[in-house]
Interface confidence: medium
């Protein structure tokens, strides 16, 4: 079979947006299966037409309605003949147009008067491509060959830059890059003490505007009264915007404030946020827990717990816990040092414990008291029925 590309030179140059019809003539075959190939890959679409001119002469057309850069490449047609693939002479399709940007100036954030660079690159065909830079609406410098780097000594306010690429087909304008001025960050906000214990506090906050420079750290300052002596200053890397304050004094009023810093310096401090650490849980267990059987039930008594330290705060109420070996159990909260226990089975052994609580929680449990089911009911006074151990 004789294959040839018709009506097209070995090199075909077309302007972007123009139509192209590549024609391929096949002679010497009755029913050729003509395939178009671009850069080694079969063109898998229906923009193709095959016309029988005579029994052994066919013309295949590949139609491109509006060529763009991606259509440029090496085209040929091929047919299968007796198990062998015959290919035509290739045609190189070049698509010319206004320059195409491969690199455009990017937005930047820079410190005042600091030098910086912007880059611009555009390609043809046709070459050569020259670059002209614009600062706002003012052209800066003469045409330079692509690629071009613009060196700027510094700016004192936000400024816009763009580049323009020229070739024989015309000009193309790049995106406009905005060069922003960096500034000190704004103060943080929404400062919250998220968790409190007697000696620790977790703090979280939202960063203010970063001043177009990455926030590097935040400082949490703690005092015992707003404007008082600094108790603690913690510098934390960010993100996350959280901090754990350790080794605080229980049941104490504190205030904290936060500021954050970028490369240019720190933000103003946010307003003071007051908080109070929790007091300590009671340190002592109630002593001398004992039981008195009565006709109506069981009376439990113990000695009052006196606070060991002011940080424990006021004590009370007491919490009583009892359990029986039949699985029955319960808890009771009482204000004094005496409790009347009901709802227990006198035929089973009873184990009782008591603790004293405050605003923080319950202190240690007392030694357990075992009230044996073998104790005689209603016995009041004899030592063996008033047992504490």
């Amino acid at each position: 079979a004789g294959l040839k590309l018709m009506g097209a030179p070995v090199k075909l140059t077309v302007s972007q947006g123009q139509p192209v019809k590549l024609n391929c003539s096949v002679e010497g075959m009755e029913e050729p299966d003509i395939q178009w190939v671009k850069d080694g890959a079969v063109v898998q679409n229906l923009d193709q037409l095959y016309i029988p001119v005579s029994e052994q002469h066919w013309i295949g057309f590949l139609s491109l309605k509006s060529v763009e850069r991606s259509d440029a490449g090496r085209y040929w047609c091929q047919v299968e003949d007796g198990g062998e693939t015959e290919i035509s002479q290739p045609v190189w399709l070049t698509v010319e147009g206004v320059p195409f940007f491969t690199v455009e100036p990017k937005d930047l954030a820079v410190p005042p008067n600091a030098p910086f660079q912007l880059s611009c690159e555009a390609v043809g065909p046709p070459e050569p491509v020259t670059i002209v830079w614009w600062r706002g609406t003012t052209k800066i410098g003469g045409p330079a060959p692509s690629p071009s780097v613009l060196n700027v000594t510094g700016v004192t306010q936000s400024t816009m830059f763009s580049c323009e690429a020229h070739n024989l087909k015309g000009l193309a304008s790049s995106r406009t890059a905005t060069v922003h001025l960096q500034a000190l960050p704004a103060a943080p906000f929404n400062i919250t003490v998220t968790k409190l214990s007697s000696s620790n506090a977790s703090v979280a906050w939202m960063p203010g505007a970063d001043g177009r420079a990455l926030l590097q750290s935040c400082t949490v300052q703690v005092t015992q009264a707003p404007g008082g002596w600094e108790v603690l200053a913690v510098v934390v890397p960010v993100p996350p915007f959280t901090c754990l304050l350790r080794d605080l004094v229980p049941a104490t009023n504190y205030s904290l404030r936060v500021r954050c810093a970028n490369a240019l310096g720190p933000s103003p401090y946010a307003d003071w946020v007051p908080f109070q650490t929790k007091g300590l849980a009671p340190a002592s267990a109630p002593q001398n827990l004992h039981a008195i059987r009565t006709d109506s039930g069981l009376i439990l008594e113990w000695e009052e717990v006196i606070p060991e330290a002011p940080l424990e705060g006021p004590l009370g109420p007491y919490k009583l816990s009892w359990v029986q070996d039949n699985g029955t159990q319960d808890e009771l909260t009482v204000e004094g040092t005496r409790a009347n226990l009901t709802g227990w089975d006198p035929q089973k052994d009873l184990i009782v414990r008591v603790c004293v609580s405050n605003a923080v929680g319950c202190g240690p449990w007392s030694q357990p008291l075992v009230v044996s089911s073998h104790d005689r009911a209603g016995q009041q006074g004899p030592p063996h029925s008033r047992t504490s151990w």
């Epitope: 679409n45 923009d47 037409l49 095959y50 016309i51 001119v53 013309i59 139609s63 309605k65």
Partner: antibody
Framework: EVQLVQSGADVKKPGASLTISCQAS????????ISWVRQKPGKGLEWMGQ????????LYGPSFQGHVTISADRSTATAYLQWRSLEASDTAMYYC??????????????????WGPGTLVTVSS | SYELTQPPSVSVSPGQTARITCSGD??????AYWYQQKSGQAPVLVIY???KRSSGIPERFSGSSSGTMATLTISGAQVEDEADYYC???????????FGGGTKLTVL
């Protein structure tokens, strides 16, 4: 003269199978593509797919892929459209279309088409 | 899947110019074809490759394409031009054809 003769109207129940045909004459069957086009009552045209008689290469529209089969018999110059299981929504007129082009001087193709008269398929229980 | 959008109807008086549009994202790269279908008849190819008139079609029919819009123009519409008109083009992938929804032309 180019002619496309389509099989007659048919009434089927849902779930039935059906094959309709389009017999070509007046040209070399293997030289051209034949398309099938659907037109539901009172509605627009829908391209279903096409086959090239020469190599029985087929292409389908996304809505019809897997629902119908397009085939051709070179010996009788006939193209076929086949359903394995008809649905009421397949009720429509089905046209076969021959795509063609000719050249004057070998470089500018002039495009033309021939349409068959259509086959009315009614699917109803 | 790819779609071509046409106005459902267009009305003109005899002798006036009728314009029927067809929009599709792939039309900047793919050719538009136009069909005329009169009531009870098979469609007829009127325009191919955006602007080429099919053999036997009167000169008052013309086609154009710009960007994502193809247009069929009938200059000096006649009563016999009353019909449904369909645009037809390749999908953006180039792997299947699509018809527009059709436009009913009324010549009052």
């Amino acid at each position: 003269e180019v002619q496309l003769v389509q099989s007659g109207a048919d009434v089927k129940k849902p779930g039935a199978s059906l094959t309709i045909s389009c017999q070509a004459s007046g040209y070399t069957f293997t030289d051209y593509w034949i398309s099938w086009v659907r037109q539901k009552p009172g509605k627009g045209l829908e391209w279903m797919g096409q086959i090239r008689g020469q190599h029985s290469s087929t292409l389908y529209g996304p809505s019809f892929q897997g629902h119908v089969t397009i085939s051709a018999d070179r010996s009788t110059a006939t193209a076929y459209l086949q359903w394995r299981s008809l649905e009421a929504s397949d009720t429509a007129m089905y046209y076969c279309v021959r795509h063609g082009a000719s050249t004057s001087g070998g470089t500018i193709p002039e495009y033309y088409q021939h349409w068959g008269p259509g086959t009315l398929v009614t699917v109803s229980s | 899947s790819y779609e071509l959008t046409q106005p459902p109807s267009v009305s003109v008086s005899p002798g006036q110019t009728a314009r029927i549009t067809c929009s599709g994202d792939a039309l900047p790269k793919k050719y538009a074809y136009w069909y005329q279908q009169k009531s009870g008849q098979a469609p007829v190819l009127v325009i191919y490759e955006d602007a080429k008139r099919s053999s036997g079609i009167p000169e008052r029919f013309s086609g154009s394409s710009s960007g994502t819009m193809a247009t069929l123009t009938i200059s000096g519409a006649q009563v016999e031009d009353e019909a449904d008109y369909y645009c037809y083009s390749l999908s953006d992938s180039g792997n299947y054809f699509v018809f527009g929804g059709g436009t009913k032309l009324t010549v009052l």
